[in-house]
């Protein structure tokens, strides 16, 4: 069961896996959650009754019964991992720890104006896990305003000590705030010849890349496929690093694949969730249980529901044996990966889906698109919402997109004349406007946050957030869309769609069924030529056909320009303005969302 509260002055006895150092019990719980085996932990807080060498220790524990005996101990704080919980989990830690020096390998020292600048520097440095910053009040003159960037093998400090007038904190890479490039390509027939920091077994290069992404020291990887000539290295995933952060040598080798950590795009790509099945593949590991199951899907469900299960192998039933049920082998290992992978034995293997909640909900695959036609089908654009105003009478006002369980992203110009959020209603999971009746459930709006530089749509900053009064429970028909990664600024999106209930031509009415149109992006240079009287800034993005004919129009405002990239949908634009609708050589102009990621995160993650 899910236990979120911390147990003060309590110590769990036994079950130790490893000890790490964390600045708080809260962060110890996060570390436990992300550790492949940890189910419980005991943290020792700073206390006069405790030996200072034990302060800030976070002992990660495991137990077959999922619990351990409790002992009273002053300054000890214990708790359970969030693995047992169904809620969304994030490793993002924005806390700043005052008067704590988090020890690690100090590899960079520079002057910074503030702790925030130091944290930003850490976030944008490929090696940095955490930092310590000496404030202006630090006794040593030469160290004042010094920002020390640090890394360790585990990503957590090797020790934490009290030091007056310093502050420490973690990289915000896991908060989606890094400006580092996001290189998603996997390079076939390539070996990166740099130092290995670890090696694990993986069924394919994609799983290897995901493991690299959440390994604290891994910057890039090489995977040897099952056709690799050296048998002992087949399915081997080598996790690598280098001083420069890039591979120093690439060697052409058949049957090997290489790629990069997706650390700086992990909020818009699944990195924990290995959802595929691997046929004719057996995963070896420590056996947890053997259960009868009807199918490999059922076996995966059993593994997902068993908190200690990390991966499984299903052997289908032989003919009419055992009521058609096969054997489901639930397994685990010290690092969450199989200890060996065998092929040709007829098994079907896969991983627990328990870790999927550590990925952003927006990365979940949605129904396949309906090709052709202009009317959408239910669940095709589950992030699309219709924003209604109730004054003077109820009507569709604008589109919007779900980007979090309490947040809608839309256009600022939608709120011209809107005096209060009380008159707004957000409807999600809607296909036809006619579905909206008196008793249709909606989300009230608690707050309208308009970008403070917004004046009018044509001059940019046409972006607004709606904070909902209640949270959205994600389902197939209502779920978030990923924000683009800052590291993805150079991505060329080729599969972009605009959706909305807006007019189909300039003089028209709101449509009943949600409309969709595939529209190509237009370069800003090209767009500027079409709008000589306006300034098309880098904070805008344009889309449209040269000949016109397909475009967003009145009523689509605030809705998404959604682009699919690497199987994940990204909110690339917000419908903003244009000259007429679908006119020849007049592309639609959209708010370029990637340029506002910091603003969105600042507003939505504010304490």
């Amino acid at each position: 069961e899910c236990v979120t509260q911390l147990l003060k002055d309590t110590c769990f006895e036994g079950g130790d896996i490893t000890t790490v150092f964390t600045p708080s019990a809260k962060y110890c719980q996060v570390v436990c959650t992300y550790h492949p085996r940890c189910l419980l932990f005991t943290f020792t807080a700073e206390s006069p009754s405790e030996d200072p060498t034990r302060w800030f220790t976070c002992v990660l524990k495991d137990s077959v019964t999922e619990t351990l005996p409790r002992v009273n101990r002053t300054a000890a704080i214990s708790g359970y991992s969030f693995k047992q919980c169904s809620h969304q989990i994030s490793a993002c830690n924005k806390d700043i720890y005052v008067d704590l020096d988090m020890k690690g390998i100090n590899y960079n020292s520079s002057v910074a104006k503030s702790a925030q600048e130091c944290q930003e520097r850490c976030t944008d440095d490929v090696h940095c896990h955490f930092f310590t910053y000496a404030t202006r009040q630090f006794p040593s003159l030469e160290h004042r305003n010094i920002c020390l960037l640090k890394h360790t093998q585990t990503g957590t400090p090797t020790r934490i000590t009290k030091l007056d007038k310093v502050v420490s904190g973690f990289s915000l890479k896991s908060c989606a705030l890094s400006n580092l490039a996001c290189i998603r390509d996997i390079f076939p027939n390539t070996v990166f010849a740099d130092s290995n920091i670890d090696s694990v077994m993986a069924p394919d290069a994609f799983v290897c890349g995901r493991i690299c992404t959440h390994h604290p020291g891994c910057l890039f990887f090489t995977f040897f496929s099952q056709e690799w000539p050296k048998e002992s290295q087949r399915n081997l995933c080598l996790l690598k690093t280098s001083e420069s952060g890039l591979p120093s040598t690439r060697i052409k080798k058949s049957k090997a694949l290489s790629g990069f950590s997706l650390q700086s795009c992990r909020h818009s790509i699944p990195v924990f969730c290995h959802s595929s099945f691997y046929h004719d593949t057996d995963f070896l590991g420590e056996e947890l249980d053997i259960v009868a199951a009807k199918s490999h899907e059922a076996c995966q469900k059993l593994c997902t529901n068993a908190v200690r299960c990390q991966f499984f192998t299903y052997t289908p039933a032989q003919a009419s044996c055992n009521e058609g049920k096969g054997k489901c082998y639930l397994k685990l290992s010290s690092n969450g990966s199989p200890t060996k992978i065998l092929h040709g034995r007829g098994g079907i293997s896969g991983y627990t889906l328990r870790l999927c909640k550590m990925d952003n909900e927006c990365t979940t695959k949605i129904k396949p698109r309906i090709v052709g036609g202009t009317a959408s089908v239910r669940g095709e654009w589950p992030w699309q919402v219709t924003l209604h105003t109730t004054s003077p009478t109820q009507r569709h006002l604008c589109g919007g997109s779900i980007i979090g369980n309490q947040w809608i992203l839309t256009a600022a110009h939608c709120f011209y004349g809107v005096e209060s959020p009380k008159i707004l209603r957000v409807y999600s999971g809607i296909l036809n406007q006619s579905e909206i009746k008196e008793d249709t459930s909606f989300f009230g709006v608690q707050e309208i946050i308009i970008h403070d530089q917004y004046k009018m749509a044509e001059s940019g900053y046409d972006i607004a957030l709606l904070k909902l009064e209640t949270t959205v429970n994600y389902t197939d028909s209502q779920r978030p869309i990923c924000l683009p990664s800052k590291g993805d600024r150079n991505v060329i999106y080729t599969d972009c769609w605009v959706t909305g209930w807006g007019y189909r031509k300039l003089r028209d009415k709101i449509q009943n069924t949600l409309q969709k149109a595939k529209i190509p992006l237009v370069t800003n240079e090209e767009c500027q030529k079409r709008y000589r009287g306006h300034k098309i800034t880098h904070k805008m993005i344009c889309a449209g056909y040269r000949e016109g004919g397909k475009d967003a129009c009145k009523g689509d405002s605030g809705g998404p320009l959604s682009c699919k990239h690497n199987e994940v949908w990204h909110l690339v634009g917000i419908t903003s303005w244009g000259e007429g609708c679908a006119q020849r050589e007049r592309p639609g102009v959209y708010t370029n969302v990637v340029e506002y990621v910091d603003w969105i995160l600042e507003k939505t993650q504010a304490v």
Partner: antibody, heavy 124, light 107 residues
Framework: QVQLVQSGAEVKKPGASVKVSCKAS????????MHWVRQAPGQGLEWMGI????????SYAQKFQGRVTMTRDTSTSTVYMELSSLRSEDTAVYYC?????????????????WGQGTTVTVSS | EIVMTQSPATLSVSPGERATLSCRAS??????LAWYQQKPGQAPRLLIY???TRATGIPARFSGSGSGTEFTLTISSLQSEDFAVYYC?????????FGGGTKVEIK
């Protein structure tokens, strides 16, 4: 062993510039700050400024602001101090001295390694 | 800037005797103070930092004390090699400043 080796003595005319070098060895050059201190004949020590060899950031004493420039070359582990618009009162022995270890935070330190000094004579 | 004043300017002591040198700061420098020894024709040598911590290789006869504005360097039993000029220096604020020095000579 850790040492700082400075360039040789210089004789300059008033109004000219002088550039003194200080080559570090035996330690990680970019991990420590470097100070420049001068001593006029028969006088005490006078601090001129500091350079952080890692990023190249500098801080100068007000008295020398606008006349002194401290630079570094990480490839040769050398720091330079250039003093322009020389006058006779700039006649002194110029020392480079290693300062704080910047890769670790601690409260107290001193200038623990000094160069042998470079005599600069300004005379018409 | 912080003005460092050393006294006396000259101290005449016999070998084997105790020498006490003073350094006063015009405002508090906490414990951010160092002491140096300089012999004729040589570069200064760090003796004490943090007001009281001996630098590597410095004999135990050298000790430092004080904090805030008043500091003392004590040489418990003067050896012949200790006759030199001693400078204090504050590390509390820019610009760094040195005292005028105390010359310790043989009595």
């Amino acid at each position: 062993q850790v040492q700082l080796v400075q360039s040789g003595a210089e004789v300059k005319k008033p109004g000219a510039s002088v550039k003194v070098s200080c080559k570090a060895s035996g330690y990680t050059f970019t991990s420590y700050s470097m100070h420049w201190v001068r001593q006029a004949p028969g006088q005490g020590l006078e601090w001129m400024g500091i350079i952080n060899p890692s990023g190249g950031s500098t801080s100068y004493a007000q008295k020398f602001q606008g006349r002194v420039t401290m630079t570094r070359d990480t490839s040769t582990s050398t720091v330079y101090m250039e003093l322009s618009s020389l006058r006779s009162e700039d006649t002194a022995v110029y020392y480079c001295a290693r300062g704080a270890y910047l890769m670790e935070l601690y409260y107290y330190y001193g200038m623990d390694v000094w160069g042998q000094g470079t005599t600069v004579t300004v005379s018409s | 800037e912080i003005v460092m004043t050393q006294s006396p300017a000259t101290l005449s002591v016999s070998p084997g005797e105790r020498a006490t040198l003073s350094c006063r700061a015009s405002q508090s420098v906490s414990s951010n103070l160092a002491w140096y020894q300089q012999k004729p024709g040589q570069a200064p040598r760090l003796l004490i930092y943090g007001a009281s911590t001996r630098a590597t290789g410095i004999p135990a006869r050298f000790s430092g004390s004080g904090s805030g504005t008043e500091f003392t360097l004590t040489i418990s039993s003067l050896q012949s090699e200790d006759f030199a000029v001693y400078y204090c220096q504050q590390f509390n604020d820019w610009p760094l400043t040195f005292g005028g020095g105390t010359k310790v000579e043989i009595k």
